[in-house]
């Protein structure tokens, strides 16, 4: 039990950063825990995420990765990573096709535990100045390029 007035020690030594990606590209979020063997959960809008053709979940030692494949405007919004009692929120912002390059034909994906399908190889930019929100999206405004804020 932490002393009154003192924040509990975060389970994360590296927190995911909010990013901005072109529609059709993958978005990759990384977190590092203080030690290996820590069970990590990822969420979107408070809803748990499980591995699928859409979501790649990988763990190597202390490094935990969430890959959101072929992002579309509907993927824009608030995400979180949870380890123990530590929860860190971060955001995904999607730049629509008319503001970015169109989706590329699927290319061979790097090997991943969940067997990723082809992904358009486009880098995710750390979130800086906010661009206009995609039409029809009711996601909240995004933070700047700082690691996600803890929400313990």
């Amino acid at each position: 039990m932490p002393e009154p007035g003192k924040k509990p020690v975060s389970a994360f030594s590296k927190k995911p950063r909010s990013v901005e990606v072109a529609a059709g590209s993958p978005a990759v979020f990384e977190a590092e825990t203080e030690r290996a063997g820590v069970k990590v959960r990822w969420q979107r809008g408070g809803s748990d995420i499980s591995a699928s053709n859409k979501y790649g979940l990988a763990t190597e030692g202390t490094r935990h990765t969430l890959t959101v494949r072929e992002v579309g405007p509907a993927d824009q919004g608030s995400y979180a990573v949870i380890a123990g009692s530590s929860k860190v929120k971060f955001d995904l912002k999607v730049i629509e096709a008319e503001k970015a390059e169109p989706m590329l034909a699927p290319a061979p994906a790097p090997a991943e535990a969940t067997g990723a399908p082809g992904e358009a190889p486009a880098p995710a930019a750390e979130l800086g100045e906010s661009a206009p929100s995609p039409k029809g999206s009711s996601s909240a405004a995004l933070n700047g390029p700082t690691p996600g804020a803890p929400d313990d």
């Epitope: 059709g24 969420q43 979107r44 809008g45 408070g46 809803s47 748990d48 995420i49 499980s50 591995a51 699928s52 053709n53 859409k54 979501y55 494949r69 072929e70 579309g72 405007p73 509907a74 919004g77 608030s78 096709a97 169109p102 989706m103 399908p117 995609p134 039409k135 029809g136 999206s137 009711s138 909240a140």
Partner: antibody, heavy 118, light 107 residues
């Protein structure tokens, strides 16, 4: 096992509002999103909106001005309220769980039939 | 909104035949596409998510392919219990939209 069950009024007068409850079991609403989808008689499926685990919502812009989705996690219930109903709102209304592997809908209720008529 | 166009509207088959359903999106949606089956007087049932990933408990005779704008659902040997309506749905952008459906009927 995962179950969703809708309950509604059956008959609604034109210009009145519609309230439907979706009661779920086998999973917690804090960790899953729930969608609302409707199907007019003899026609296809139409997505109305959804509520996320954290209570945030996304709506079909066509209905956003007269649609509200909310929930009570402790009662495992999700609520749909639609105002100003017209005869073309006659449909079967379904609630469906959002798949944790993405935005598909993995489990559906049996639906509740709503007729808008005077 | 993204328009999902399904063809044909009706497919007539004999048991044991291989059948293909087509769904075309009005814009590139990657693989953000799902297939559902709805039997008469029943609720929709998820068959395939993200174009090609079979949902748990779905018979192996169902498969999905496609990416971008063109998608296909196949049943490699139709059984009588497969007689139903089939819908595609995109989750690339809000609002989520469904195709008008293809009705599978017996010859």
């Amino acid at each position: 096992q995962v179950q969703l069950k809708e309950s509604g009024p059956g008959l609604v007068a034109p210009s009145q509002s519609l309230s439907i409850t979706c009661t779920v079991s086998g999973f917690s609403l804090t960790g899953y999103g729930v969608n609302w989808v409707r199907q007019p008689p003899g026609k296809g499926l139409e997505w109305l909106g959804m509520i996320w685990g954290d209570g945030s919502t996304d709506y079909n812009s066509v209905y956003k001005s007269r649609l509200s989705i909310s929930k009570d996690n402790s009662k495992s219930q999700v609520f749909l309220k639609m105002n100003s109903l017209q005869t073309d709102d006659t449909a079967r209304y379904y609630c469906a769980r959002r798949d944790t592997g993405g935005a598909s809908m993995d489990y559906w209720g049996q639906g509740t039939s709503v007729t808008v008529s005077s | 909104d993204i328009l999902m166009t399904q063809s044909p509207a009706i497919l007539s088959v004999s048991p044991g035949e291989r059948v293909s359903f087509s769904c075309r999106a009005s814009q590139n949606i990657g693989t953000n596409m799902h297939w559902y089956q709805q039997r008469t007087n029943g609720s929709p049932r998820l068959l395939i998510r993200f174009a090609s990933e079979s949902f748990s408990g779905i018979p192996s005779r169902f498969s999905g392919t496609g990416s971008g704008t063109d998608f296909t659902l196949r049943i490699n040997s139709v059984e009588s219990e497969d007689i139903a309506d089939y819908y595609c749905q995109q989750s690339y952008n809000w609002p989520f939209t469904f195709g008008a459906g293809t009705k599978l009927e017996l010859k």
